[in-house]
Amino acid sequence: ELCDDDPPEIPHATFKAMAYKEGTMLNCECKRGFRRIKSGSLYMLCTGNSSHSSWDNQCQCTSSATRNTTKQVTPQPEEQKERKTTEMQSPMQPVDQASLPGHCREPPPWENEATERIYHFVVGQMVYYQCVQGYRALHRGPAESVCKMTHGKTRWTQPQLICTGEMETSQFPGEEKPQASPEGRPESETSC
């Protein structure tokens, strides 16, 4: 079941998943000047079964000049606000995701992909937060958020992380402790 909302936004922090649960969508977004091909899917889908999962559909981008599109007149800043999800300059493989049944690895980049990946997560997904460069993490608890189902509605737990403006960066849990993966975590909360 898809989570209704996006994970919480923490000032001066980004989040990422170590692996993606089946049913997760990754939007086919393209960088400026390029567009999803006309016959292309809206998204890639993590699909499969408990023993093997993979990404279904392929994202393809084409030059926007070759498509019947109109440029929006509202001026868009080239640098938008701090990115809250995966930035694609550094593809991530922080843990051995093959050991997570029912999960997909981070999919490889596609040509002319946008810098920011837009995921639609499913119930039970866990994401991990880290402070952006130039900010230091003050932990009051786990720097992670889980999408849970409660009383028929989805919600993300609040990560216990504050990022302060000191020139020291923290790592994602999986990068400093490879065992800190979604394995063994509660997948959903259905009791009311």
Epitope: L2, D5, D6, G23, M25, N27, C30, R32, R35, K38, S39, G40, S41, L42, Y43, L45, T47, D56, N57, S64, T69, T70, K71, Q72, V73, T74, Q76, Q80, K84, E116, I118, H120
Partner: antibody, heavy 114, light 107 residues
Framework: QVQLQQSGAELVRPGTSVKMSCKAA????????IGWVKQRPGHGLEWIGD????????DYNEKFTGKATLTADTSSSTAYMQLSSLTSEDSAIYYC???????WGQGTLVTVSA | DVVMTQSQKFMSTSVGDRVSVTCKAS??????VAWYQQKPGQSPKALIY???YRYSGVPDRFTGSGSGTDFTLTISNVQSEDLAEYFC?????????FGGGTKLEIK
Amino acid sequence: QVQLQQSGAELVRPGTSVKMSCKAAGYTFTNYWIGWVKQRPGHGLEWIGDIHPGGGYIDYNEKFTGKATLTADTSSSTAYMQLSSLTSEDSAIYYCVSRNFAKWGQGTLVTVSA
Amino acid sequence: DVVMTQSQKFMSTSVGDRVSVTCKASQNVGTNVAWYQQKPGQSPKALIYSASYRYSGVPDRFTGSGSGTDFTLTISNVQSEDLAEYFCQQYNSYPYTFGGGTKLEIK
């Protein structure tokens, strides 16, 4: 909570135009396409087109090229659709949709009548 | 354009029954199909994405299946609140297209 709030019903004259709005809340407006869908009794649902507020690109169903104009204002997280040269065929409920069709607005009823 | 055909405009069923709504695409659309439920006077509600994945809050009596050109929405243990019109949609290629709808009537 993700919400798409559409503007109210419109009663308009043939030959004129109408502009309706769709205000998004509860998610990052610039991250997701916003599409528009037309519904007329006996005609089912028709996809009009969509706009990406972040990239600013727009796609139209060829059937609605020249009829519909899609715009978006990122400062207010609002998408707009203008319909021109209205006829009775344009009398319908118009929905905005987002987040890969997961979320739908409540609809705007447009009635074209002399 | 891809034509999505829902051959049955109306279906009649009883509470507790199992009913299957079908949808046929004029060409291969993979699993890029969604199902929507629309109750009288309301906007459509998304039930299923990618042919078989349920959205949050959708009861598990709603099941989607199929790929390629043939798709089915199955409602097991039909409830009175399932009285609605059901639409399929393909988003495999532009322009995205919808089926004509199937109205479910409860006996």
